[in-house]
Every structure is written in C-alpha cells, then in structure tokens.
Interface confidence: low
Amino acid sequence: WQVPRPPTWGQVQPKDVPRSWEHGSSPAWEPLEAEARQQRDSCQLVLVESIPQDLPSAAGSPSAQPLGQAWLQLLDTAQESVHVASYYWSLTGPDIGVNDSSSQLGEALLQKLQQLLGRNISLAVATSSPTLARTSTDLQVLAARGAHVRQVPMGRLTRGVLHSKFWVVDGRHIYMGSANMDWRSLTQVKELGAVIYNCSHLAQDLEKTFQTYWVLGVPKAVLPKTWPQNFSSHFNRFQPFHGLFDGVPTTAYFSASPPALCPQGRTRDLEALLAVMGSAQEFIYASVMEYFPTTRFSHPPRYWPVLDNALRAAAFGKGVRVRLLVGCGLNTDPTMFPYLRSLQALSNPAANVSVDVKVFIVPVGNHSNIPFSRVNHSKFMVTEKAAYIGTSNWSEDYFSSTAGVGLVVTQSPGAQPAGATVQEQLRQLFERDWSSRYAVGLDGQAPGQDCVWQG
C-alpha cells in the first residue's frame, strides 16, 4: 500500500488531461527536504479574516488582512504547485441561484486559478464526498484547464466529510482556516484563518495531511491500518516546529482529525485543543460557529462533554477567565442554547469563576437572498500562551469522524514590540468582536428569535 510515484514537480501540463474529473494521476509531490532547505526559510504568519459586507466595526479597531486579498496574493506567489484541501467549492453566484455583486470576489478567485493553470502551475484539489455543493461546476471547469481533482469518500470511509480548508503552495506557503472555497466566505460570512509564507518545514508537514486525503481519493481506497512512514509528522504538541517568524521565536504544529487520518507523530485535533485549554492560566477565548457537547450527526445523539468539561475545569479549577463567542444565524440550530446557558450558569464571580457566553449575530440586512450566509463561521481559540486556528466546529463528530486540521502557534512575548505575538493579535480580534454591538449576551436572547438581529 504505497503512494503512487507522481510526476516531477511542474511537469503536469494544464488542460492536457481528459475533460472528466481527474482520478488517476497524482499531483506533483513536494520537493525533497534537502532541496527545500536550499532556499532558506524566513517564516511569516499573517492573520486573515473575512468581514461580511455591511458589518461596520468601530473606527480604529484591530483588523486582519482581508481573506480575499490574501488568497489572490498567495496565488500570485505560486510558481510550481497549489494543493487545496476543501470541503466543497462554490465560487460563482449562479451555483446557488443567486445573482449578487458580492460573488465577484469568488469569481475573481476562479479566474485567477484558471490563469494559474495557464502558467503550467499544477493545481491539485482534494474535496469531500459527500459534498454540499452539488450544483457547482468550479471543479469541472478547472479540470478542463488541467487541474487534478479527487473526491475523498469520507462518508464511506469514516461516516464523515472532508471538512478541512487549507492550501499548500509550492511546498513553502500555507493558508488554513475556517473559510470554504465559497464566494460567501469572502464577502458574506465572518471567517478567520492564517497565511504562513516562506515556511517549507511547516508547509511540507501540512502537505503530508493533504497526501493522506489524496491517496484516499482513488477508487476503492481503504483506510490503512497503519500509515506508511512517509506520512509521519515530525512536528506535534510534544515536539513542535521551532523557528523565527519575522524574527520572533515561535513554536507551531498542525493537528488533524479524525484519529484514523493521524499517521504516526500527528497530534489529534481534539488533543491539541485540550492541550491549549489545559495550559491556559489567565484566559481562554474561543470563537466558534457551533458549540454542542453532543454528537451532531449520529442518531440518537450522544452526550459528549469533553470540551465542555475542559472549559469548566479551567474556569472552576484554575480561575481561568473563559469567554465563548458562538455564531448565530438564520440556520443556527436552537437546541444549542440550553448548552450555552448551562455553561454560562457555572459563572460565579464571587468565587472567582468567570464564564461568559455571547452569540455573534450578523445582521442579514438586504442580503436575505443569499442562503447560508451572514454568520460567524470562525473556529479559533486564544489563550495568553497560544493561538489555535481550526477548521472544526465544536461537537463530537468533527473530531471523531470528520477530516479537519488545526494550527497551534505560540510566540515568545518580550522579544518584540508589545502586542505583536500571534496570540496577542488574535486576542485583540476576539475582543473587538466580543465588545461589538453584534455580540449579544444570552440574557438578551428571546427564545424563538435567538438569531435575529434586534438592532
């Protein structure tokens, strides 16, 4: 059971494949580590975000680089290969029967990808089966231009989906975060992610996760009992990558879910989250679209208090200040609210137990024609010690059966100007959202109207 030997880097000819979805050939494998290290790493991490249109924030408030701009820049840097792991693709408005000018950024991205293929740059896409976007033709259009596309049958393999959202560019640059390959992620949904530039060690580690998807995308693929050694990770929570990011001493590693897609050395995503929570001594701030201490996709649902217990233990046992900001939109399941209220009920300032829960409501405004939008879709957590940026919602299935990834970064304070660590930048973004008028305490939420902006 071996990875097929792929073509040499940069030799895949665009538009020179059958016009059907690509199955047989592999994407160009990343360069050998020795080759990569000839080009010295100078890692740089940039937080990126999407703010839905017509969602003004206070003047002077902190912000991250716009996601659409970052994605287009990342594609501009590409010289040899772009590997994309994605839940689904829907970059054009008519995919979902919508004619809205806010889809143009997604269409610009699709245009850029077509141009990339024209430059003989290899594009490999691992995407989910099952998929949400049954009417999208983005991938057929890219395949016609020479992209390699594999659908990873997670439904058959683990009874989940491929929920990851990351790119590896030239084996040197990375995007990962909450945003799907969806025009709404650029203009209509609140997202958060990170771009890491010039960091071949981390990029090639994340590439190994991409390759786990890639080999499972061939017909009749089965999960291996043990992943071959070339899928193993050298970076994990016990031995993170150590490097300088813009001169700042940094440790970082990628986690993955589900356990079946964690070869040797890969930290499980849930373990990474729990480790970050467990090391916090001052605060844990988390911004997630969904929070359920249960399963979500198994019937009957099971109770699953792992993350809930960890937050309670941190607040109750160590006096850590816990803040949870949860997405709230027209498609939010109202059965989530009792769990949020239960968590909040633990709060007892007199006993130094601080647990606060708010929901973030994006006003729909005149965008009601756009389905599954106008929501906080972020999946991140920050403590005084570390930043965690993920692709998973917080319920059991995302960690047990669904493919996702997480990034854990810790930067040393004091070695740079105040406020420059990644965790400090992320804390500022969280606090901007937490203190905004769109973040509403549970007390202000009337049942049945939980996610309608009251203005």
């Epitope: 538009k15 008519p94 269409e107 293929l117 024209g118 430059r119 033709t137 259009v141 016609a144």
Partner: antibody, heavy 118, light 107 residues
Framework: QVQLQQPGAELVKPGTSVKMSCKAS????????MHWVKQRPGQGLEWIGD????????NYNEKFKSKATLTVDTSSSTAYMQLSSLTSEDSAVYYC???????????WGQGTSVTVSS | DIQMTQTTSSLSASLGDRVTISCRAS??????LNWYQQKPDGTVKLLIY???RLHSGVPSRFSGSGSGTDYSLTISNLEQEDIATYFC?????????FGGGTKLEIK
C-alpha cells in the same frame, strides 16, 4: 484601454501557409488567454484554439489541430496564428480575442480576412 | 463537443420593442454562457458573460438569463444601433462552441 490589432487582409495561394498577427495593448499580455476564432463568409463562429502567453500553453479544437499553430512573442505583446496547407475552405475572417472573465472572450480584434486563391 | 443551437436565424422587430433571442446547449453548461454582438462591418463585442453578467460599457437594456441547457438574451428597448447578429457561446467544456447566430433586423 484594451486593443487587439490585426492586419486587414491576406491573399495567399493554395498549398502555402500564412502567419497572421494580433498585437495586444492596454493590458498585461502574459496574464490572459488569447483565443482565435474563424468565420467563413455568411457563416457562424468557430473556435480554433487558445494560447496562454505566460507559458505558451495551448489548446486546440481537434478540428484545427493539424491546420493551426498558435505562438506568441511576449516582447512585442503579439500573438500569432499560422495556417498551413491552405485550401479554399480556409478562406475566412480570423479573429483574435482576449480570454477574460470565466473564459468569455471580452475584447476582439477587427479580424484578418484570408483569401485562398490561385 | 457541446452543440449550441439558436433556432431563430433571423428576427424582425420594431424600434422600442422588447426582443428575446434564445440559445440551447446539447447538455448542461452550468451558466457558462456568453453572448456576443457582431455588427454588419464585422466588429464583434462581448455583451454578457456567465449567463447574466453585463460586460463593462454594455447598455443596461441588454440582459441575460437561463440555466442548465436553455438561455436567452433580452433587449428591452430596441435601438437602431442594436441591428446586428447575436451569437451565444458556451465556456463550460473544451472546445468552446458557438451558436449559429441570430440576425436582428428592423421591421
């Protein structure tokens, strides 16, 4: 503004070849596909193929694979199409067109009229 | 190859009329449908791309719609300068293919 300049006409003999040009200006030549389209007198439009000047990557309509050869000169921002072994069937107007958003041909040249006659 | 069919090869209308030109693909082209205008002097212009997106500089009296295999171009208020032949083109699957054209004339 985007402009594609093509010579107006070419008169050529059967069995020979012709190489027509399309000079682009007003945009980054190497970032957009260049399409070539044939129109016989009183007929519709037929796509011949396209070329990406940033890499010389090409696509051809199977029907024109042995007839047309697409090339570019990036230093002069000029695309070329050579037609070989000409017959009267090749008498037509040939247009170059820039491949814009989502492969729509957003700007067209004025066309070169090729007449094959002995 | 995908066949593009414009069933009406010529159409007569009066100035000020609302005119609709239709185009059918031999298979689903997922909105990758473009419309071009060719004037009698041979000049070709893109009017609408991706079914309904108006190309820059094109008057708003032109609009496009459709999905799957059936598409149409509408001119809401016919003007003299709209006298031309109109072609549809699919951009979903190589090779790109055009409809046979619909020639628009004044009554």
């Amino acid at each position: 503004q985007v402009q594609l300049q093509q010579p107006g006409a070419e008169l050529v003999k059967p069995g020979t070849s012709v190489k027509m040009s399309c000079k682009a200006s007003g945009y980054t030549f190497t970032s957009y596909w260049m399409h070539w389209v044939k129109q016989r007198p009183g007929q519709g439009l037929e796509w011949i193929g396209d070329i990406y000047p940033g890499s010389d990557s090409t696509n051809y309509n199977e029907k024109f694979k042995s007839k047309a050869t697409l090339t570019v000169d990036t230093s002069s921002s000029t695309a070329y199409m050579q037609l070989s072994s000409l017959t009267s069937e090749d008498s037509a107007v040939y247009y170059c067109a820039r491949g814009g958003w989502l492969d729509a041909m957003d700007y067209w040249g004025q066309g070169t009229s090729v007449t094959v006659s002995s | 190859d995908i066949q593009m069919t414009q069933t009406t090869s010529s159409l007569s209308a009066s100035l000020g009329d609302r005119v609709t030109i239709s185009c059918r693909a031999s298979q689903d082209i997922s909105n990758y449908l473009n419309w071009y205008q060719q004037k009698p002097d041979g000049t070709v212009k893109l009017l609408i791309y991706y079914t309904s997106r108006l190309h820059s500089g094109v008057p708003s009296r032109f609009s496009g719609s459709g999905s799957g295999t059936d598409y149409s171009l509408t001119i809401s208020n016919l003007e003299q300068e709209d006298i031309a032949t109109y072609f549809c083109q699919q951009g979903n699957t190589l090779p790109w293919t055009f409809g046979g054209g619909t020639k628009l004339e004044i009554k």
